[in-house]
């Protein structure tokens, strides 16, 4: 996912709805005007705000990268939801890109979890049942298996 940037809006276009802030804040889908007296709506499909706020701009909508599918579009109150394509996943510690799932587990391990858009396949040691650390094994060590079938 490309990093969220911010879209400044110096002047509201005529079609943008205006309302007054409540307790100094504007509702989701809006930002506050530069004089602090009005709430200006975000532009559908371009930017958004998710919470009551006094931001002077709305957050720019994320564009899904190649290798991602768009699960839901950006609205004025919610950012685009992107998901890794089938066979790839996004790690918590490197959320900026989708990585290919491993095709199988190393020798002496069995697969207990499938590839999902948010996790690699999960491998555990046959005997102990402890999880594999996640390093990609050398090719000759890899034991491939068809989906749902434990490696033997």
């Amino acid at each position: 996912i490309t990093q969220q940037d911010l879209a400044p809006q110096q002047r509201a276009a005529p079609q943008q709805k205006r309302s007054s802030p409540s307790e100094g804040l504007c509702p989701p889908g809006h930002h506050i005007s530069e004089d602090g007296r009005d709430c200006i709506s975000c532009k559908y499909g371009q930017d958004y705000s998710t919470h009551w706020n006094d931001l002077l701009f709305c957050l720019r909508c994320t564009r899904c990268d190649s290798g991602e599918v768009e699960l839901s579009p950006c609205t004025t109150t919610r950012n685009t939801v992107c998901q890794c394509e089938e066979g790839t996943f996004r790690e918590e510690d490197s959320p900026e890109m989708c990585r290919k799932c491993r095709t199988g587990c190393p020798r002496g391990m069995v697969k207990v979890g499938d590839c999902t858009p948010w996790s690699d396949i999960e491998c555990v040691h046959k005997e102990s049942g402890t999880k594999h650390s996640g390093e990609v094994p050398a090719v000759e060590e890899t034991v491939t298996s068809s989906p749902g079938t434990p490696a033997s």
Partner: antibody, heavy 117, light 110 residues
């Protein structure tokens, strides 16, 4: 002349309370957001909190629970009520006028608060 | 909350030098950033607002630039009167994120 003048500072014992005043002239405080900032001796500027034109108040985490910002429109004056004062609250306290897009455009001269036994 | 990181914390330069101070925001604030100058025993004074707009009465040797998370205050030709501490402050989302100032940059004349 457009100006802000803070008063009410002084020496106060730990655990005590103090109310600072900020008198505005040349403009109407209720038409602006107003901000309180403090500066401990030899340190940088620290945001305390602010009050919007409609009277809503917001505070820095460090000020929540002990400090209260208010204003009296008839006196064109802003207040900072400080309770349960500690030695680390020793600082020069500034009030200032805050405009959303243009920042803190007008500052008072500050008033020194010393918390010590 | 938004954190503002200023660098350097102190700098020493000669009269006539070009001086640059940097301010980094922990999240994007578009161009809504102000710079302040403070001299010992005095209240801060606004120099720049909206990242690059010069406040009234401020000498043209001061300029600001940047957007998003990276901002710069430049003094094109340092003068003795510029010896002071300089602070940056975000101006969007004060209720939402707070309005923490940068840690300050003390400018000394060699």
């Amino acid at each position: 002349e457009v100006q802000l003048v803070e008063t009410g500072g002084g020496l106060i014992q730990p655990g005590g309370s103090l109310r600072l005043s900020c008198a505005a002239s040349g403009f109407t405080v209720s038409r602006y957001a107003m901000i309180w900032v403090r500066q401990a001796p030899g340190k940088g500027l620290e945001y305390i909190g602010f009050i919007t034109s409609d009277g809503s108040t917001y505070y820095a985490d460090s000020a929540k629970g002990r400090f209260t910002i208010s204003r009296d429109n008839s006196k064109n004056t802003l207040y900072l009520q400080m309770n349960s004062l500690r030695a680390e609250d020793t600082a020069v306290y500034y009030c200032a006028r805050y405009t959303y897009s243009d920042g803190t455009d007008l500052w008072g001269r500050g008033t020194l608060v010393t918390v010590s036994s | 909350d938004i954190q503002m990181t200023q660098s350097p914390s102190t700098l020493s330069a000669s009269v006539g030098d070009r001086v640059t101070i940097t301010c980094r925001a922990s999240q994007s604030i578009s161009t809504y950033l102000s710079w302040y100058q403070q001299k010992p025993g005095k209240a801060p004074k606004r120099l720049i607002y909206k990242a690059s707009s010069l406040a009234s009465g401020v000498p043209s040797r001061f300029s600001g630039s940047g957007s998003g998370t990276e901002f710069t205050l430049t003094i094109s030709s340092l003068q003795p009167d510029d010896a002071a501490t300089y602070y940056c402050q975000p101006n969007s989302g004060i209720a939402t994120y707070g309005a923490a100032f940068g840690g300050g940059t003390k400018v000394e004349i060699k």
